[in-house]
């Protein structure tokens, strides 16, 4: 059997189909999930939908063999098999491995460490999302692209704020979180607040009390 891989986002509508023509004048066509769980069977000009978690969410096009599934969820992850009984009585099968992924949530950036080291500012940030298998990329004024959840960098003395963006992504979606750091490095933790993304129209910043007061008056 030929195997095709498909990755889709949860909640979407999916079409499972094969890239080739169906055998001519086939007798029967059946879609299964896993090896032997029938979803729908076309036989003698009629489609029979089986009692399964898909009932009411699927539709078969007997012309092309395509199976339409609405509102897929992660629980629909499976290998789907289309078996066609040809007029000679032999079957032919095609397999589609469907992976359904949730869109990644917006990451939260945490300050793991912040300290003075020889007049420079050592900064360790982590990009946190709840239990997902994702890719991480950090953007900003960095010597090289960093592709894990933790960013460690040393800043030379500077006057302006520095911003770092963490992008989390899977094969169906990506989200960013941005952290802006205002000098000095030794600013007391109590003088700083973490402002939510919504408050700042899309950015997450660590900002001083003074700036915070100013921000709320505009």
């Amino acid at each position: 059997g030929r195997l095709v891989h498909m990755t889709v986002v949860s909640g979407s509508n999916v079409t499972l189909n094969i890239s080739e023509s169906l055998p001519e004048n086939y007798k029967q066509l059946t879609w299964f999930y896993t090896f032997d769980q029938k979803i729908v069977e076309w036989d003698s000009g009629k489609s029979k939908y089986f009692e399964s978690k898909f009932k009411g969410r699927v539709r078969l096009d007997p012309q092309s063999g395509a199976l339409y599934i609405s509102k897929v969820q992660k629980e629909d992850n499976s290998t789907y098999v289309m078996r066609v009984l040809k007029k000679d009585g032999y079957e032919q099968e095609w397999k589609i491995k469907l992976q359904v992924l949730d869109p990644v949530p917006k990451p939260v950036i945490k300050i793991e460490k912040r300290e003075d080291v020889d007049d420079n500012c050592y900064l360790k940030l982590s990009c946190v999302i709840p239990g997902e298998s994702v890719n991480y990329t950090w953007y900003g004024e960095l010597p090289k692209e960093i592709q894990n959840s933790v960013l460690e960098t040393t800043l030379k003395p500077h006057k302006h704020s520095r911003c770092y963006t963490c992008q989390v992504s899977n094969s169906v979606s990506s989200k960013n979180g941005t952290f802006c750091f205002s000098p000095p490095c030794t600013a007391a933790r109590s003088e700083q607040k973490l402002i939510s993304e919504e408050d700042l129209g899309g950015e997450q910043k660590l900002i001083s009390e003074e700036d915070l007061h100013h921000h709320h008056h505009h």
Epitope: G1, T30, F32, T34, F35, D36, Q37, K38, F50, E51, S52, T79, V81, R83, G89, Y90, E91, Q92, E93, K95
Partner: antibody
Framework: EGQLLESGGGLAQPGGSLRLSCAAS????????MSWVRQAPGKGLEWVSL????????YHADSVKGRFTISRDNSKNTLYLQMNSLRAEDTAVYYC???????????WGQGTLVTVSS | EIVLTQSPGTLSLSPGERATLSCRAS???????LAWYQQKPGQAPRLLIY???SRATDIPDRFSGSGSGTDFTLTISRLEPEDFAVYYC?????????FGQGTKVEIK
Amino acid sequence: EGQLLESGGGLAQPGGSLRLSCAASGITFGRYAMSWVRQAPGKGLEWVSLISGSGGSTYHADSVKGRFTISRDNSKNTLYLQMNSLRAEDTAVYYCAIYNNYNWFDPWGQGTLVTVSS
Amino acid sequence: EIVLTQSPGTLSLSPGERATLSCRASQSVSSNYLAWYQQKPGQAPRLLIYDASSRATDIPDRFSGSGSGTDFTLTISRLEPEDFAVYYCQQYGSSPRTFGQGTKVEIK
């Protein structure tokens, strides 16, 4: 009415291997999904492995996954079960059966006994 | 997976009597996809009933199946000497396919 005849059973050491065969006659073999079902001495029935008519997809019980492999040669009308890393708990009579319409098992062969012991 | 529990474990009856065997599923068996098999000592199982109540080819009409959802019954209306055997139920409503542990029908 088709007939199925198993062979290849016998005594094997723990960790050893055996290959079972099931020869089909009186049926157009390639039209049917096939299965192996086993029965430990004095116990009930447990399906082991399944294979589609074309041989394009297979399915194994968790208890044998990674150790047993089902295959078929439609030109020889024969079903196989390659059993590796055998354990004492694999001791059973192994039956091949047609997996009728991917639903029930009918007909069955007469079975072949596999004993795993040191 | 669906667990099938058969009762009683052993049924002691005389020829000519009626036998009632039960198969209970841990969850509903979709579309009543349940089969019954008979197995005699030293022999392979033989299909008796499929789809809960349809008799397989060449099965005598003294064998009948009924039930739905989680409760299924195999009835042998009048036991013949050749009916003393072990009977298994099997569901094919969900994967993996599972069998009951069997009911032995023995001569009283």
